[in-house]
């Protein structure tokens, strides 16, 4: 009779993340009587994943049954594949010895991939507001897919952009991969309502990418435009002066009036108007008492916004 | 605003049978008015889908809010897909109009495969049974698959075969297709315990290839050989002649002695020895009186096996 | 919640002006073409213009020329600018929203009363 | 212009009944056609458009259908609530026009 091979009729077999695996395997003889083995690796370090003869291996299960005399199928089947379980196949037959079998005839082997899905993409944006006509960086991760390969874009609004870098780690064979994008986007005025979003495609998601989105109203801080103006009163020793604060975001802005320097009153903005881009706008109004004054009187109207240094805008205010 | 587009990004997508297709679609403006509609194919005999402004669409689920006159998504999911649902899926939009709507512009078009599983493969033999050293062929099937892109191998007894011709129609495009393969195989004495396996890889089969098989015992005759014998005897007027009928295939034998060409004795095969080879063993004996013999008798053991043609073995008793 | 509020309206002589205006809440005010209808006390409804997102317009021969659309995204705002009035431009004047897929209006404001008198 | 002839013009029923009022355009207007429904003192409320279709939070009650030039609306069981003048409007192309209006009132 011919001499026994080891058939692993499949080079590779690929499967998704949390189904089974089988690993076929046949014996053209019956003949040397001894066990078979199934060894993820070669050489020294190669790890045993079934051993015929003796043992305890819940994920897996024969397709045949090898306790038959006639049997010559070996093929096994590994149930909840992990990317972990990535990884060569060796189905191997030892001969029947003492004090220990000894190896006989190894399969070629059955490369097993495994199909994992990228987790959710974060996308994270900078730490400290920027204002408009300033570039942020904003980074996407995803991580624990498998194939390597795996297309990133970015969009900005629904328009894709094309400033950005991506890494795929790490460079060499691995059981599953990560994937870091950092994106660099111009802010506008407009941007309060925008949004950036990260999208990623991967054999494993059968053409429904995922999505991570942030809001750029997190990164942007678009500074108020100041206008002071005196408003027509009927009392004659009374000026009304106000001061219109112009699309702002972030909220937060703390308004102080000084006549000719000196402080005369303090407001933090409470109730704004939320204009249709997203931004605020505030008005505070100051009466003054020109029976109080001999000469020409310099408002300031002085805001600080976001904790950032304070603009102005002065009036001079005619007492005749 | 610039001229509405109609984007269809995806140009092919893939569906395992029975599961959900999405197809995307966007539009890039909101004007002008008019309704969108789904169809599979182009031109005159295209297949209407999904029509936005009336019709009832058990399958057809859209992904978003389509009444709302701000949508601009008109992306749909198809349920329970199968290979008649194969095509190029066109997104039109039409522009409101009277006594019809009017076609205002169409999506590039996304082409739905559709991934089916081939059939169980069934495997023929021949019609009537052949000897050893004779060639038979087999023929396998698999039907209703879907890519075309299918591959077939022959095993006997776990070992590949190359004498075989496969076609895969039809040759043109379809919604599924079907194999067929006749494979030609040399029977030898052994082959009665042998299998041959047809083994059909295929893209939804995930490296787990479907098998049909057949055994060679339903199209090999072994014929038996004869060897007739004398037995030694302590009774001096009888002889014991055997007829040990070797390694023959099916069971089917009939047996009849023949002393100087004059039927003595007709026997059917009953209990039979099994060889490891599957073949069968049967012995036949015959007491011969030598006291009714004045001269030589020629005795023939004729063996008539499955019908066929009988063939006979002769021995020459002496009488002394 | 979706919402639209007329304004502006009032008593106004033969020949005269008003500007009606219709604010609108709860929605993207931009991506909807947006109608004025009126009804004269007793009477059925009539459309009287429409402006659509891309701001074109139009108007039926009844207001063509007298009365203008017009509308500020930023502000959510559609306005009717009515010049030349006549007696028979007597109404309750409503804004509605073409909202959905086809156009149809879905949303309409309460009114708001314009008389043209002596 | 396209013309809108209702009918009828006004119409007693009682409670629970099932009523039709119809529509009819000078000239084909597809299905672009709605269906309001407006009582006195009050803004009009869409109920139906392209002709067949249900506006949100409208009660299945309310049914249209026709297409080309003929259209109807029926209220399959009549409420207190649903007395009112209802009017049909086509939208196809503009001018878009009402008809004059049927006033349903309670028998």
């Known amino acids: 009779e011919d001499e026994l091979q080891v058939i692993q009729p499949e080079k590779s077999v690929s499967v998704a993340a949390g189904e089974s695996a089988t690993l076929r395997c046949a014996m053209t003889s019956l003949i040397p009587v001894g066990p078979i083995m199934w060894f993820r690796g070669a050489g020294a370090g190669r790890e045993l994943i079934y051993n015929q003869k003796e043992g305890h291996f819940p994920r897996v299960t024969t397709v045949s049954e090898l306790t038959k005399r006639n049997n010559l199928d070996f093929s096994i089947s590994i149930s909840n594949i992990t990317p972990a379980d990535a990884g060569t196949y060796y189905c191997v037959k030892f001969r029947k010895g003492s004090p220990d079998d000894v190896e006989f005839k190894s399969g070629a082997g059955t490369e097993l991939s495994v199909r994992a899905k990228p987790s959710a993409p974060v996308v994270s944006g900078p730490a400290v507001r920027a204002t408009p006509e300033h570039t942020v960086s904003f980074t996407c991760e995803s991580h624990g897919f498998s194939p390597r390969d795996i297309t990133l874009k970015w969009f900005k609004n629904g328009n894709e952009l094309s400033d950005f870098q991506t890494n795929v780690d790490p460079a060499g064979d691995s059981v599953s991969y990560s994937i870091h994008s950092t994106a660099r986007v111009v802010l506008t005025r407009g941007d309060v309502h925008s949004q950036v979003i990260c999208e990623i495609a991967h054999i494993t998601l059968q053409g429904d990418p995922l999505r991570g989105t942030a809001n750029l109203s997190e990164a942007i801080r678009v500074p108020p435009t100041l206008e002071v103006t005196q408003q027509p009163m009927r009392a004659e020793n009374q000026a009304n002066v106000t001061c219109q604060v112009s699309n702002f975001y972030p909220r937060g802005l703390q308004l102080t009036w000084l006549e000719n320097g000196n402080v005369s009153r303090t407001e933090t903005a409470s109730t704004l108007i939320e204009n249709k881009d997203g931004t605020y706008n505030w008005m505070s109004w100051l009466l003054v008492n020109t029976c109080a004054h001999r000469d020409d009187v310099v408002l300031t109207c002085q805001v600080e916004h976001d904790g950032q240094q304070a603009v102005s805008k002065s009036y001079a205010l005619e007492i005749s | 605003e610039d001229e509405l587009q109609v984007i269809q990004p995806e140009k092919s997508v893939s569906v395992a049978a029975g599961e959900s297709a999405t197809l995307r679609c966007a539009m890039t403006s909101l004007i002008p008015v008019g309704p969108i509609m789904w169809f599979r194919g182009a031109g005159a005999g295209r297949e209407l889908i999904y029509n936005q402004k009336e019709g009832h669409f058990p399958r057809v689920t859209t992904v978003s809010e389509l009444t709302k006159r701000n949508n601009l998504d008109f992306s749909i999911s198809i349920s329970n897909i199968t290979p008649a649902d194969a095509g190029t899926y066109y997104c039109v939009k039409f522009r409101k109009g009277s006594p019809d709507d009017v076609e205002f512009k169409s999506g590039a078009g996304t082409e739905l495969s559709v991934r089916a599983k081939p059939s169980a493969p069934v495997v023929s033999g021949p019609a009537v049974r052949a000897t050893p050293e004779h060639t038979v062929s087999f023929t396998c099937e698999s039907h209703g698959f879907s890519p075309r892109d299918i591959t077939l191998k022959w095993f006997k007894n776990g070992n590949e075969l190359s004498d075989f011709q496969t076609n895969v129609d039809p040759a043109g495009d379809s919604v599924s297709y079907s194999i067929h393969s006749t494979a030609r195989v040399v029977l030898t004495r052994g082959d009665v315990h042998s299998q041959v396996i047809c083994e059909i890889a295929h893209i939804t089969l995930q490296g787990d290839p479907l098998r049909g098989t057949a055994n060679l015992s339903e199209a090999i005759r072994v014929p038996p050989t004869l060897e007739v014998t004398q037995q030694p005897m302590r009774a001096e007027n009888q002889a014991n002649v055997t007829c040990q009928v070797s390694n023959f295939y099916p069971r089917g034998l009939q047996l009849t002695w023949l002393e100087n060409g004059n039927v003595s004795r007709t026997e059917t095969a009953s209990t039979l020895i099994e060889n490891k080879d599957g073949t069968y063993n049967w012995m036949s004996w015959l007491l011969v009186n030598t006291c009714a013999h004045r001269d030589d008798v020629v005795l023939t053991c004729q063996v008539e096996h499955d019908g066929q043609q009988a063939v006979s073995k002769s021995y020459a008793l002496e009488i002394s | 919640e979706v919402q639209l509020v007329e304004s502006g309206g009032g008593l106004v002589q033969p020949g005269g002006s008003l500007r009606l205006s219709c604010a609108a809440s709860?929605?993207?005010?931009?991506?909807?073409?947006m109608h004025w209808v009126r009804q004269a006390t007793g009477k059925g409804l009539e459309w009287v213009s429409v402006?659509?997102?891309?701001?074109?317009?139009y108007y039926p021969g009844s207001v063509k020329g007298r009365f203008t659309i017009s509308r500020e995204n930023a502000k959510n705002s559609l306005y009717l600018q009515m010049n030349s009035l006549r007696v028979g431009d007597t109404a309750v004047y409503y804004c509605?929203?073409?909202?959905?897929?086809?156009?149809?209006?879905?949303?309409w404001g309460q009114g708001t009363m314009v008389t043209v008198s002596s | 212009d396209i013309q809108m002839t209702q009918s009828p013009s006004s119409l007693s029923a009682s409670i629970g009944d099932k009523v039709t009022i119809t529509c009819r355009a000078s000239q084909d207007i597809n299905n672009y056609l709605a269906w309001f429904q407006q009582k006195p003192g009050k803004a009009p409320k869409s109920l139906i458009y392209t002709a067949s279709s249900l506006q949100s939070g409208v009660p299945s009650k309310f049914s249209g259908s026709g297409s080309g030039t003929d259209f109807t609306l029926t209220i399959s069981s009549l409420q207190p609530e649903d007395f009112a003048t209802y009017y049909c409007?086509?939208?196809?192309?503009?001018?878009?026009?009402f008809g004059q209006g049927t006033k349903l009132e309670i028998k």
């Open positions: 409007q086509q939208y196809v192309s503009y001018p878009y026009t």
């Open positions: 709860g929605f993207t005010f931009s991506s909807y073409d």
């Open positions: 509605a929203r073409g909202g959905s897929w086809d156009d149809a209006f879905d949303i």
């Open positions: 402006i659509g997102i891309a701001g074109d317009t």
